[in-house]
Amino acid sequence: LPKAPVITTPLETVDALVEEVATFMCAVESYPQPEISWTRNKILIKLFDTRYSIRENGQLLTILSVEDSDDGIYCCTANNGVGGAVESCGALQVKMKPKITRPPINVKIIEGLKAVLPCTTMGNPKPSVSWIKGDSPLRENSRIAVLESGSLRIHNVQKEDAGQYRCVAKNSLGTAYSKVVKLEVEVFARILRAPESHNVTFGSFVTLHCTATGIPVPTITWIENGNAVSSGSIQESVKDRVIDSRLQLFITKPGLYTCIATNKHGEKFSTAKAAATISIAEWSKPQKDNKGYCAQYRGEVCNAVLAKDALVFLNTSYADPEEAQELLVHTAWNELKVVSPVCRPAAEALLCNHIFQECSPGVVPTPIPICREYCLAVKELFCAKEWLVMEEKTHRGLYRSEMHLLSVPECSKLPSMHWDPTACARLPHLDYNKENLKTFPPMTSSKPSVDIPNLPSSSSSSFSVSPTYSMT
């Protein structure tokens, strides 16, 4: 007698490992024999799909090599035309041993930056990821964390973070280890011992000593008055990532000697500089045909503005040049009672660099004036209102004594950088922060279409002097 189909063994949840065989059984009783079809996630499985084997008149469905993507709900439907079609469903849960899909790679990182070592995993159940440094499990702390993705994040990388790392992915089915990778921590060049200035007699021998460190170990070069050292002997030694350089000189003229420590980080370099002046005892008394002499700035007003150990021109038309020029800057400042925060650092730098001009040492020491373009930028962009006040007071003779003549440079009389870039001095960059920029003079547009990063604002609201290191 005809009999409607009945599924005698309903489908069950099947657990299967990747690359293994998984079988669903759908036993059916009926007469006549039913047609049995299979679906995965409600999509019909085609009889000719070579990834599957359908046997026993359709009652057995075998997945020949389980893949991660085979997860889902499998249903069999039986129909023989007698009564309605019947259906039974079961789930396939693909289990997978841990697998590291994106292993960590060797990393070189600069001290203080953030390092991320990737370790992306697959597996079911989801593997837990831990890390090993050297031979020991890595402990997480406020700086070191294993992210949800399995990657290792190290904030503010320190020298001691350098070493060999590997990640471990673990679930109930097994454990996977990544290959060992190296984290190398690089450190900017830094000067540990700066050369000292000397005041010596003509024909003396002087040894300048400079010590620097960094990872990789920096190289040290010596510069004499802006050029590579042409004479003198250099001795170097390296021990425990510290380089020690000694420059021995036979002194026949005064000069500014700069020790430059440089190391390379990928395509970029970091540099640290320290300078010392060599002055000759009798040279400090200017010769009659000189209008001044070079000396290290020792005042206070321009301390934050002029580069450390800067050689400045002291004008001998004053009885006491240092005191007179210092008073000159002081006086100019006292006359500017209200100065905007945008103008102040620019005006400070301009006045200091104008009154204490950079000095080019030599038989006839020469002052190096500020480049006209930098003067104009201060005058018209940063200090437009204040400049008018200064010029007005200068013309009306409101400055005490006659020292005001030097206070405000006449930009048009200064040399242009286009004529000879070495004949004039640039003003260093302003340390601007966004707060200052809100009050910037509306020279051009009411809606500035510019992106200015947050630069560190200088504590003395002045121009920044060369940092200990710079990236070039």
């Epitope: 930028a377 286009h418 302003l430 510019v450």
Partner: antibody
Amino acid sequence: EVQLVESGGGLVQPGGSLRLSCAASGFTVSSSSIHWVRQAPGKGLEWVASISSSYGSTSYADSVKGRFTISADTSKNTAYLQMNSLRAEDTAVYYCARSEGDRYVSGYFGLDYWGQGTLVTVSS
Amino acid sequence: DIQMTQSPSSLSASVGDRVTITCRASQSVSSAVAWYQQKPGKAPKLLIYSASSLYSGVPSRFSGSRSGTDFTLTISSLQPEDFATYYCQQSGVWLITFGQGTKVEIK
């Protein structure tokens, strides 16, 4: 000798993208300001964008804001102009030019060196 | 935004003539104004920067001056090679504006 060489121009459909390069030699991009200026056929000069690498600051003309991005790779001594959502009115010869100094001072030096220009045509 | 209105848009002159081109800024600006010469198919060339400074290698017959918001380029004695288009350009801290250009043609 200072030289600027532009590349990357060509024909692109409206809505498309192009990236122009400006390779500099004889000076360092990091100590200068780099500008892109364009000139539509038979028209005058129009400033497009500027970058001052020492500050990392950038600025754009209103007509390209939000569509164009100026950048510089100081290690390659090259500046770039990424142009997205291109329109027919962006058709022009694009010049890159440099000026001395940083953002605040560069204006006083003028654009002293220019490239030969690269033609960008936006047409369907 | 600041507009730089350049006049005249074109002029005809003879060799030896004195030529004056003016740019007027729509509001108070700095002296960061430059003048350029451009010949067909070529990139512009810098002539004057900072309103009145002559760029190196530029003949002394070219000069620039400023009076308030008016900027002037003067060619004291026009030469055959001076027939070209001239542009003024103003630089602010945030943006740059060019004048529309003045075409100097042979009369």
